[in-house]
């Protein structure tokens, strides 16, 4: 793992909304040259968010991943203020940046220095959503879509950065945004090229210009504070690529805003998830539509461009 | 419709084993984590732990480590819990439940399943 | 852990009237609380999360609130069918914690 870095390679525009302590595995600060001081906070899904290190909920939840990495370490863990499971996902992923958040890929072509090391099972998983993020949705509606993968972790709105890539080299890409009424804003996140000669395992790519999204898809988390409870399910493009940055992610009451993920994760033997319609409750989510990326490998720049589904919105009553 | 589906009441003898299923149905069960809660009669609620389907990876309530085993076969949608090294302790209603991926309180809960630890 | 207390333990009421549960967690959960009811018998069912979200289907003479440590569980013009036991549930940490229930019953 490489962190012999000054210059700033994550920027904080905007700080995510409170997220439960228990769908947290890691944290760490921002570099000094950022300029903004931020808490890059690690989901068990491994997608990324910027937090603001004087919001309260944010100092207990660090204070909480200490105590819990030093009860790791005293049972011979190896973790660095991680704690949770870091395995190779055999489900897709999805990871997001916010629209405020800028990568900036080290020299070894990093995008951070997030990467999970790998150590115990029982170390390995600490959120508790849903293993990221909880796993069926319930929202004021009462109906559970298909629900989305595990890799995702609702998450607060336009904080995400992308999420790390638990040992892979396949890369997962999927737009995902919160359940909520009137249109998502899909903003930039701009990173600075790798270096072409960097081992392919260990490119970024960087996120360009993703197109406005009006009706983003969700990734199964529940839109915080809104009451809905959807059990989506997306089905995702996977690109043979490295960690790739990516965008915001946007969650009502983990803040409102536009979310767009990229996420990075192994290939599963699984293929992508079927996109059943299944739904029960009474919450009505809206509907959804998947982003795909395009990804060229020479550029390693990636364009999230909306495409509609009409399946994505089917529900189960 | 998201169900689901406890196996039947349990009558076993101090020292012995058990394992209760939990069939899910009305989702895709890969992706949503299965929780286990434990209440003695007349009882509050006792978080046990929580399985992912997707990948099998569990996490316990530390007070259930040693005593709690979780597994998930995602061929047939069900969850197992196995209690072992069976006390009167262990008798009660053990639930399992699902909930969202943005923090895990339950939405859907199964019947319940009744163990009863008596020699 | 946290620890979730509830009070009161129990509360007899009428059909009509309005009555507030409460819930204390022995540190700050940072409204990540959910409420249940349940009645004799049954599993529980979800009424509330984010400390006052309704959840679907649930009626809006059901209202939550607080912050910090100190939560509550208003029920206006009480039913017959919301009679039962409702208990509070953190998840802002694990392990997850439960309220020891409080037991609403018809006067």
């Known amino acids: 793992q490489h962190h012999g870095v000054t210059k700033c390679n994550i920027t904080c525009s905007k700080m995510t909304s409170k997220i439960p302590v228990a769908l947290l595995i890691h944290y760490q600060q921002n570099q000094a040259s950022c300029g903004k001081r931020a808490i890059i906070l690690e989901t068990r899904q491994h997608r990324l968010f910027c937090a603001d290190p004087k919001e309260q909920w944010v100092k207990d939840a660090m204070q909480h991943l200490d105590r819990q990495a030093a009860a790791l370490t005293r049972n011979g863990g190896t973790f660095e203020k991680q704690i949770g499971e870091v395995k190779p996902r055999t489900t897709p992923a999805a990871g997001g940046m916010d629209e405020s958040v800028v990568l900036e890929p080290e020299a070894t072509g990093e995008s951070s220095s997030l990467e999970p090391t790998p150590s115990s099972q029982e170390a390995q998983r600490a959120l508790g959503t849903s293993p990221e993020l909880p796993t069926g949705v319930t929202g004021s509606s009462g109906t559970r879509l298909p629900p989305t993968p595990k890799a995702q972790d609702g998450g607060p709105v336009g904080t995400e950065l992308f999420r790390v890539p638990p040992v892979s080299t396949a890369a997962t890409w999927q737009s995902s945004a919160p359940h909520q009424p009137g249109p998502s804003l899909w903003a930039e996140a701009k990173t600075s090229e790798a270096p072409s000669t960097q081992d392919p395992s260990t490119q970024a790519s960087t996120a360009s210009s993703p197109a406005p999204e009006e009706n983003a898809p969700s990734e199964g988390q529940r839109v915080w504070g809104q009451g809905q409870s959807p059990r989506p399910e997306n089905s995702l493009e996977r690109e043979e690529m490295g960690p790739v940055p990516a965008h915001t992610d946007a969650f009502q009451d983990w803040g409102p805003g536009s979310m767009a993920h990229v996420s990075v994760v192994p290939v599963s033997s699984e293929g992508t998830p079927s996109r059943e319609p299944v739904a029960s409750g009474s919450w009505t989510p809206k509907a959804e539509e998947p982003i795909h990326a395009t990804m060229d490998p020479q550029r390693l720049g990636v364009l999230i461009t909306p495409v509609p589904d009409a399946q994505a919105a089917t529900r189960r009553q | 419709q998201v169900q689901l589906q406890q196996s039947g009441p349990e009558l076993v003898k101090p020292g012995a084993s058990v394992k209760m299923s939990c069939k899910a149905s009305?989702?895709?069960?890969?992706?949503?984590?299965i929780h286990w809660v434990k209440q003695r009669p007349g009882q509050g609620l006792e978080w046990i732990g929580w399985?992912?389907?997707?990948?099998?990876?569990?996490k316990f309530n530390e007070r259930f480590k040693g005593k709690t085993t979780l597994t998930a076969d995602k061929s047939s949608n069900t969850a197992y819990m196995l209690l072992s090294s069976l006390t009167s302790e262990d008798s009660a209603i053990y639930f399992c439940?699902?909930?969202?991926?943005?923090?895990?309180?339950?939405?859907?809960w199964g019947q319940g399943t009744t163990l009863t630890v008596s020699s | 852990d946290i620890q979730m207390t509830q009070s009161p333990a129990s509360l007899s009421a009428s059909v009509g009237e309005t009555v507030t549960i409460t819930c204390r967690a022995s540190?700050?959960?940072?409204?990540?609380l959910a409420w249940y009811q349940q009645k004799q018998g049954k599993s529980p069912q979800f009424l509330v999360y984010?400390?006052?979200t309704l959840a679907d289907g649930v009626p809006s003479r059901f209202s939550g609130s607080g912050s910090g440590t100190q939560y509550s569980l208003k029920i206006n013009s009480l039913q017959p069918e919301d009679f039962g036991i409702y208990f509070c549930?953190?998840?802002?940490?694990?392990?997850?914690?439960f309220g020891g229930g409080t037991k609403l019953e018809i006067k």
């Open positions: 439940a699902t909930g969202p991926t943005d923090g895990d309180y339950f939405d859907y």
């Open positions: 399985i992912y389907p997707g990948d099998g990876s569990p």
């Open positions: 009305g989702y895709t069960f890969t992706n949503y984590y």
């Open positions: 984010n400390e006052k």
């Open positions: 540190g700050n959960i940072h409204n990540f």
């Open positions: 549930q953190q998840f802002w940490s694990t392990p997850y914690t």
